[in-house]
């Protein structure tokens, strides 16, 4: 039975004999981040039972994690490149505080968590170069982010584990939606 790159894979496509277009470079970059998320999810799932927990909904209510919806113009029906790109960049900017929260949440994968955070910053820069309508992109308020970070770090151990799991799961899905949408641009 075939085994493709999954949650346990580090296998990104082979080296190229010709230069990549900017879209292909972004595609490969997102794949690299997804590999990092997989490694982090592996550690999270190994050290707690959060990945099988049925109490996700309880914790999810307290998080405002970006999610792709049909109105964002990234789906095939009603696809709108400008609207979609704004949603992608805005969403990634909103995830930054959550990626900052993840920095102290890993023991054996500390470098991987840092790599995911830094690679996301680079991805945002790539995409901002691509965007025509930069004025429509809202950047989260630093003070709002700081208080959110404090609040998340003050949670009990169980909620912190659950928050870590939910951030990784949501960021993975958001990036997968991005991959699909960006391939249409």
């Amino acid at each position: 039975a075939p085994v493709l790159p999954g949650e346990d894979s580090k296998n990104v496509a082979a080296p190229h004999s010709q230069p990549l277009t900017s879209s292909e470079r972004i595609d490969k970059h997102i794949r690299y981040i997804l590999d990092g998320i997989s490694a982090l999810r592996k550690e999270t799932c190994n050290r707690s039972n959060m990945c099988e927990s049925s109490k996700e909904a309880l914790a999810e209510n307290n998080l405002n994690l970006p999610k792709m919806a049909e109105k964002d113009g990234c789906f095939q029906s009603g696809f709108n490149e400008d609207t979609c790109l704004v949603k992608i960049i805005t969403g990634l900017l909103e995830f930054e505080v959550y990626l900052e929260y993840l920095q102290n949440r890993f023991e054996s994968s500390e470098e991987q968590a840092r790599a995911v955070q830094m690679s996301t910053k680079v991805l945002i820069q790539f995409l901002q170069k691509k965007a025509k309508n930069l004025d429509a992109i809202t950047t989260p308020e630093p003070t709002t982010n700081a208080s959110l970070l404090t609040k998340l770090q003050a949670q009990n151990q169980w909620l912190q584990d659950m928050t870590t799991h939910l951030i990784l799961r949501s960021f993975k899905e958001f990036l997968q939606s991005n991959l699909r949408a960006l391939r249409q641009m």
Partner: antibody
């Protein structure tokens, strides 16, 4: 173990609507990055991608057949349904469903059903 | 629409020989090309993805190469079970398209 199984009529009359169901197991239709697609193969000919549906209900159709195709899913039943209207004898083919996607939302099919031969004849 | 042209249409070889199958894209698709094997009466089976990435469970005698517009599937030493039809697939952009296939038959 990932499996996909197609079901539907083996014979349809011209102008009728074909409804095919793909029942999957071993993975969830709601797992992010995943999807299910339909591909057909007329006897002795090459493969042709028809449509697919992603985990979040985003859909894609082959533009040449888009007006005739509808794809939907029922996650609770682990089923994906394809309907094709106004069937014609040239639509006689083996219809396959296949799993698509993965971590990188790959545009490829890694697991396939065994296929169902649909004949269009009066 | 990206058109994939496979050559030759038929390849007549003996077991133990090396098979070289070609797939050419009408425009650059980077490494977003996948190869499938199909035996009579069976569904296709994924062999190689992203031009050269191998899949666990697929024998090491199957390998892929290429990027851009020209791609090759190589079977280093044909086994009796390798005689089948091989298809390449554009995984770069819509609509997803397949080549017309190369039939590898016993000489």
């Amino acid at each position: 173990q990932v499996t996909l199984k197609e079901s539907g009529p083996v014979l349809v009359k011209p102008t009728e609507t074909l409804t095919l169901t793909c029942t999957v197991s071993g993975f969830s239709l709601s797992t992010s990055g995943m999807g299910v697609g339909w591909i057909r193969q007329p006897p002795g000919k090459a493969l042709e991608w028809l449509a697919h549906i992603w985990w979040d209900d985003d859909k894609r159709y082959n533009s040449a057949l888009k007006s005739r195709l509808t794809i939907s899913k029922d996650t609770s039943k682990s089923q994906v349904v394809l309907t094709m209207t106004n069937m014609d004898p040239v639509d006689t083919a083996t219809y396959y469903c296949a799993r698509i996607g993965g971590l990188y939302v790959d545009y490829l099919m890694d697991y396939w059903g065994q296929g169902t031969l649909v004949t269009v004849s009066s | 629409e990206i058109v994939l042209t496979q050559s030759p249409a038929t390849l007549s070889l003996s077991p133990g020989e090396r098979a070289t199958l070609s797939c050419r894209a009408s425009q650059s698709i980077s490494d977003y090309l996948h190869w499938y094997q199909q035996k009579p009466g069976q569904a296709p089976r994924l062999l190689i993805y992203y031009a050269s990435q191998s899949i666990s469970g697929i024998p090491a005698r199957f390998s892929g190469s290429g990027s851009g517009t020209d791609f090759t599937l190589t079977i280093s030493s044909l086994e009796p079970e390798d005689f089948a039809v091989y298809y390449c697939q554009n995984g770069h952009s819509f609509p997803w398209t397949f080549g017309q296939g190369t039939k590898v038959e016993i000489k």
